[in-house]
């Protein structure tokens, strides 16, 4: 799976969309999980309604919401009041049996609020030298991660 980058501004809401084949994933609940380390497990943040037919109902876990358009085939995750610690690698998942298929890998980047004059030193950005010219931009806030880019911030 390629990784799609979604950028949001600190303090604001970020909407992440994960398209999928609605027939292929018929009857399957969806989930949003956070990747723990490059090789680590994906820790469930929130999942859609226990009843698949009610997947359109928004479910919240803290500041993260999930809703699923099961006919149109779009899973939407909303991160409200985006914070620097929300930056990182996530997955949209389709659940079947005890297993999960990855629908999309997502890198969330948190940008400094241009109206916030506090020190932005704790916000993580990918290396400035990286070129995104060929990246596929789905929305103004998203792009695909280029080959060779590192999806995790460097650890000090």
């Amino acid at each position: 799976h390629n990784t799609t980058v979604f950028q949001g501004v600190a303090g604001q809401s970020l909407q992440v969309s994960c398209p999928y084949d609605s027939m292929k994933h018929w009857g399957r609940r969806k989930a949003w999980c956070r990747q723990l380390g490059e090789k680590g497990p994906c820790q469930r943040v929130v999942s859609t309604h226990n009843l698949w037919l009610l997947s359109f109902l928004r479910r919240w876990n803290g500041s993260t919401a999930i809703t699923d358009d099961t006919l149109g085939g779009t899973l939407t995750i909303t991160l409200r009041n985006l914070q620097p610690h929300d930056a990182g690698l996530y997955q949209c998942q389709s659940l079947h049996g005890s297993e999960a298929d990855t629908l999309r890998k997502v890198l969330v980047e948190v940008l400094a609020d241009p109206l916030d004059h506090r020190d932005a030193g704790d916000l993580w950005f990918p290396g400035e030298s990286e070129s995104f010219e060929d990246a596929h931009v789905e929305h103004s806030i998203s792009r695909s991660l280029l080959e060779g880019e590192i999806p995790f911030p460097p650890t000090s």
């Epitope: 027939m23 292929k24 009857g27 399957r28 079947h96 297993e99």
Partner: antibody, heavy 123, light 107 residues
Framework: EVQLVQSGAEVKKPGESLKISCKGS????????IGWVRQMPGKGLEWMGI????????RYSPSFQGQVTISADKSISTAYLQWSSLKASDTAMYYC????????????????WGQGTMVTVSS | EIVLTQSPATLSLSPGERATLSCRAS??????LAWYQQKPGQAPRLLIY???KRATGIPARFSGSGSGTDFTLTISSLEPEDFAVYYC?????????FGGGTKVEIK
Amino acid sequence: EVQLVQSGAEVKKPGESLKISCKGSGYSFTSYWIGWVRQMPGKGLEWMGIIYPGDSDTRYSPSFQGQVTISADKSISTAYLQWSSLKASDTAMYYCARAGHYDDWSGLGLDVWGQGTMVTVSS
Amino acid sequence: EIVLTQSPATLSLSPGERATLSCRASQSVSSYLAWYQQKPGQAPRLLIYDASKRATGIPARFSGSGSGTDFTLTISSLEPEDFAVYYCQQSSVHPYTFGGGTKVEIK
């Protein structure tokens, strides 16, 4: 009528290649997973693998990975099971079956079955 | 892979009697279990999915129960056409394994 029609019986020699087919009709072939099941003479059912014809996403049972190839041609609503080099132990009845759609259950229920293709491998 | 053990291997009963077939999984499969019927020379037929829901067109005398590791298929009153081999199948974890089958034969 929703149905899966499989190709006819085959008699082959060890080492030969073979491709059997399963043609769907009466429903949107690209919208349902298709599974393959083996039944050796006088024995039970064995899960081989599954394919989603819409994008050819395929999952194999470890027992059959590398032994067979599952594929599909959505333009003619047909799924395939093939061998590059048959063995006598491949002698069996092979079934294709459609995985149904169930609201609020993401499990697999094979609701429509082909009539089966008998493959005999003998020198 | 998950191993499904069906018991008994053979069940000898008379028409009108109640048949109770068991399927035990080597680890929990939640409700991701289906039951199939197969008659000689025919392809299998789906009877039960989600451990307890009858497939389309399946008579009410067939019922399924259980969750986790222990499942039961019950035929409340055997009809002559019910004498066949019955298989359970899990779809919790791939590969989606079948049980070895239970043959229900006429006593």
